[in-house]
């Protein structure tokens, strides 16, 4: 007769491992007992369990409650056992020793491999600001056994670097994603992808990029010079900019206080019916936590009674 087993049994942490040992004997042969032992190099043999044809299943106190026979129906020549709730410390070499009648004793070894799926974590880097050089956007770490694979999935252009730390029964892999921040990256997803034989599918953690910036400011509303005349209603100036975080707006008049009746509504400056006292230099001040910008315009309210043309100057400053 001969023993049938596997060279390697692979199981995911927490699952049950079936350790196969089947005696394929000749007609009339009987299996008296099957002894299972842990036989890691240099540590000697530690009995795990013994299946006896008359006395039944014996389990070592060290494995109490964790070793069972497979559910019935059972073949009397099958010495396989189930190791419940596999833990990392179970990984190693096991020996199955079968005592038969009348053929004698047979033995075989297998290796139990316990896969420890990783629990990845993603850590964003320092705040990203437009104008910085190559900057850490995020790092992703995953620890498992065997070592997991950590990659990135993104439309953003950048560079990656990985490092690995080996522990006694596992390995931790950290991958970093570096980029040169630009405003076009704002809101773009950066996804860490972790692959591992113990995972049914890749694990993905997504980080949304936030790049601080502030665009140049400009003022709209003076495009048609002829509209700015005495008595006109609904005249307004609008300050244009964009930024991350969203900027706040403030209006001032360079050559004095804002005229009475002029209404400030965020980025918009609303005028009452125009008079000559609304003529002047207006400044839009845009700011966020990253930066600030100014844009100023000169308003010249025309008197329709006069033939002189309206003069408008646009000046932008940072």
């Amino acid at each position: 007769g001969e023993l049938e087993t596997s060279d390697v049994v692979t199981v995911v942490l927490g699952q049950d491992a079936k350790l196969p040992c089947f005696y394929r004997g000749d007609s009339g042969e009987q299996v008296g007992q099957v002894a299972w032992a842990r036989v890691d190099a240099g540590e000697g043999a530690q009995e795990l369990a013994l299946l006896h044809s008359k006395y039944g299943l014996h389990v070592s106190p060290a494995y109490e409650g964790r070793v069972e026979q497979p559910p019935p129906p059972r073949n009397p020549l099958d010495g396989s056992v189930l190791l419940r709730n596999a833990v990392q410390a179970d990984e190693g070499e096991y020996e199955c020793r079968v005592s038969t009648f009348p053929a004698g004793s047979f033995q075989a070894r297998l290796r139990l491999r316990v896969l420890v799926p990783p629990l990845p974590s993603l850590n964003p880097g320092p705040a990203l600001e437009e104008g910085q050089g190559l900057t850490l956007a995020a790092s992703c770490t995953a620890e498992g056994s065997p070592a997991p694979s950590v990659t990135w999935d993104t439309e953003v252009k950048g560079t990656t670097s990985s490092r690995s730390f080996k522990h006694s029964r596992s390995a931790a892999v950290t991958s970093e994603f570096h980029l040169v921040p630009s405003r076009s990256m704002n809101g773009q997803p950066l996804t860490c992808v972790v692959s591992h034989p113990g995972l049914l599918q890749d694990q993905r953690i997504t980080h949304i990029l936030h790049v601080s910036f502030l665009a140049e400011a400009s003022v709209r509303g003076l495009e048609d010079q002829n509209l700015w005349h005495i008595g006109r209603e609904g005249a307004m100036l609008k300050c244009l900019s964009e930024g991350q975080p969203p900027p706040s707006y403030n209006w001032t008049r360079l050559d004095g206080p804002l005229p009475s009746g002029v209404r400030v509504d965020g980025d918009t400056l609303g005028f009452p019916p125009l008079t000559t006292e609304h003529s002047g230099i207006y400044v839009c001040h845009v700011s966020n936590e990253f930066s600030s910008r100014d844009s100023q315009v000169t308003v010249d309210v025309l008197d329709p009674q006069e033939d002189s043309g309206k003069q408008v100057d646009l000046v932008s400053a940072s």
């Epitope: 008296g32 007992q33 002894a35 032992a37 530690q46 009995e47 795990l48 369990a49 013994l50 006896h52 044809s53 008359k54 006395y55 014996h58 389990v59 070592s60 106190p61 020793r97 005592s99 038969t100 009648f101 009348p102 004698g104 004793s105």
Partner: nanobody, 122 residues
Framework: QVQLVESGGGLVQPGGSLRLSCAAS????????MGWYRQAPGKQRELVAT???????NYADSVKGRFTISRDNANNTVYLQMNTLKPEDTAVYYC????????????????WGQGTLVTVSS
Amino acid sequence: QVQLVESGGGLVQPGGSLRLSCAASGSIFSINVMGWYRQAPGKQRELVATITSGGSVNYADSVKGRFTISRDNANNTVYLQMNTLKPEDTAVYYCTADQLGPLGLLSPTIYWGQGTLVTVSS
């Protein structure tokens, strides 16, 4: 041949404890599994607990948590510590053993002791 001699039986009140011992002698070079069976009056012999030379154990459901089997391989002795005894534990307790022969051949012979009486009664 293997000779098995039990000791430690007697009368005990319900809830009490007893410790049985069984010493093996004779051709004991390859004693494999040792243990205890019991037979109550008018009933079939039933397995109580057995232990391998490597220390793996097997208990009947009816005694789990109350009885503990242990073994001294150096002296070829097996013990059965019986706690929280019940009247239904009353029986003759038999020591049992089998042997691994040359080449790991499991002997079809199981050896038995003469038995020791345990009576649980108030």
